[in-house]
């Protein structure tokens, strides 16, 4: 899994004028990690971890870049002629990636109201646009005003590339990210879903990176994807992520499923509870 | 600590009927199902059927089909196999083992020797 | 029923060697298979589940791999007390069916 650097970044018009504010969320890794506004960026460690790895760090020079691209993005909004009544946002979404073998990826997209309509590799210049004609129009306008302005906008939209790639180096060296591996903790429960037939639900929570396999077996094999109905991986709250997995079973046959969780090179699998008992022997390897 | 204690060794005459017991410690017993295993000696293993310890209800491979029944008394956490119609050839240990999930074995019960001879 | 086809049926080794131990099954099972060691006198004692899950106790001088209808058993390093019987057994079908047994016996 490569490490990762997310900017995201939204300013908004009321009524065809541009508000004065800006709002910056970073993700490192993944993971929450710096929130700013025009007056400043705070950490935002996400549980213990991340304090202790963060301390008490300032944010001074965040805060000035990403102000400045704040001011850039307030622009580029100003110049969107489809300004109509109402609220309206515009969003810059910027990522870059190391892998393991020290390639990189970067990427930059545009979003209007939520719509995606621009977007542009940072490696290779190169930009793509959806199909519909209100995205195009839209990216038309914004790539001529990026164009014109390229000085006013000092060198922003050039650098972000090795910008972003600096800071992620920064933010690697200096030690803030961690490679670390929580292992989730899974547990199993059922409800009466209608008669003779119950809903088994497999819980992983706790967990980090994202990255899980959770599923239900009946006698040792795996269930077709269309019996199960998957959860998102959802963060939550303590810099680490939660989902499930649930099926429908006859009542009765409890003993026959397991679910099984892939997390990060470690297995477990975990039965069903028969009646009401909930605390079960789960085999981890 | 989970543990499946078996009844002692049985010699038992052809034609006659042997009752094995299967005492499961250290776990909720309606949990998990019961698996019987045959081994005759020298020989590898046979798996025989399970029963679910939750409903009751016996699954039997088709080679004891007819021969073999299995029973619970789950108010002592007890599971029985019961062979019927002895013969010599089935002169072997047979084993309980829990059933996880219904595909594998993860605890065995020590074994119970059974001698059909006349 | 499915058949399972373990080799060999016997072989000798000394402690420190790498014993490789192989299971064929007459059809494939996706990889839905346990390894069991079994010592004279004793219970069999689950190892791998899943083709290549160790469980919960069990060295990682163990381990298992394979696909389709081939499936190997690997212990790194043997140890005294690795001397036992080896049994591969499928749940891909019922009824469930194990192999005939590999004999792991001092040189």
């Known amino acids: 899994e490569p490490h990762s650097l997310r900017y995201n970044l939204t300013v908004l018009s009321w009524d065809g004028s541009v508000q004065s504010g800006f709002l910056t969320e970073v993700h490192l890794d993944g993971q929450p990690f710096l929130r700013c506004d025009r007056q400043k960026c705070r950490a935002k460690p996400q549980g213990q971890w991340a304090e202790d790895v963060l301390g008490n760090k300032t944010w001074d020079r965040e805060t000035r870049d990403l102000t400045g691209n704040g001011k850039d993005l307030r622009m580029t909004l100003a110049h969107i002629k489809d300004q109509k009544e109402g609220l309206h946002s515009l969003q810059e979404i910027r990522v870059c990636e190391i892998h393991e073998d020290n390639s990189t990826r970067s990427s930059q997209h545009f979003y209007y109201d939520g719509e995606l309509f621009l977007s542009q590799n940072l490696e290779t210049k190169e930009w793509t646009m959806p199909q519909s004609s209100r995205a195009q129009t839209l990216a038309m306008n914004v790539r001529n005003f990026l164009k014109e302005d390229a000085m006013k906008t000092k060198t922003h939209y050039h650098a972000m590339h090795a910008d972003c790639l600096q800071e992620l180096r920064r933010y690697l060296k200096s030690g803030v990210v961690l490679r670390r591996t929580v292992p989730p903790m899974v547990n199993v429960t059922r409800s009466e879903a209608s008669e003779g037939n119950i809903t088994v639900t497999c819980r992983a929570s706790g967990f980090y990176p994202w990255n899980i396999t959770l599923s239900w077996r009946q006698d040792g094999v795996s269930l077709s994807h269309d019996t199960q109905q998957w959860g998102d991986v959802l963060p939550d709250g303590n810099g680490t992520y939660q989902t499930w997995v649930a099926t429908r079973i006859c009542q009765g046959e409890e003993q026959r499923f397991t679910c099984y969780m892939e997390h990060s090179g470690n297995h477990s699998t975990h039965p069903v509870p028969s009646g009401k008992v909930l605390v079960l022997q789960s085999h981890w390897q | 600590q989970i543990q499946l204690v078996q009844s002692g060794a049985e010699v038992k005459k052809p034609g006659a009927s042997v009752k094995v017991s299967c005492k499961a410690f250290?776990?909720?017993?309606?949990?998990?199902?019961m698996n019987w295993v045959k081994q005759a000696p020298g020989q590898g293993l046979k798996w025989m059927g399970w029963i679910n310890t939750y409903t009751g209800e016996p699954t039997y491979a088709d080679d004891f089909k007819g021969r073999v029944t299995f029973t619970l008394e789950t108010s002592i956490s007890t599971a029985y196999m019961e062979l019927s119609r002895l013969r010599s050839d089935d002169t072997a240990v047979y084993f309980c083992?829990?059933?996880?999930?219904?595909?594998?074995?993860?605890?065995w019960g020590q074994g119970t020797l059974v001698t059909v001879s006349s | 029923d499915i058949q399972m086809t373990q080799s060999p049926s016997s072989l000798s080794a000394s402690v420190g060697d790498r014993v490789t131990i192989t299971c064929s099954a007459s059809q494939g099972i996706s990889n839905y298979l346990n390894w069991y060691q079994q010592k004279p006198g004793k219970a069999p004692k689950l190892l791998i589940q899943?083709?290549?899950l160790l469980h919960s106790g069990v060295p990682s001088r163990f381990s298992g791999s394979g696909s389709g209808t081939d499936y190997t058993l690997t212990i790194s390093s043997l140890q005294p007390e690795d001397f036992a019987t080896y049994f591969c057994?499928?749940?891909?079908?019922?009824?469930?069916?194990f192999g005939g047994g590999t004999k792991v016996e001092i040189k």
């Open positions: 057994q499928q749940y891909s079908k019922f009824p469930r069916t």
């Open positions: 250290g776990y909720t017993f309606t949990n998990y199902g």
């Open positions: 083992a829990r059933n996880y999930g219904n595909y594998l074995f993860d605890y």
């Open positions: 899943y083709t290549s």
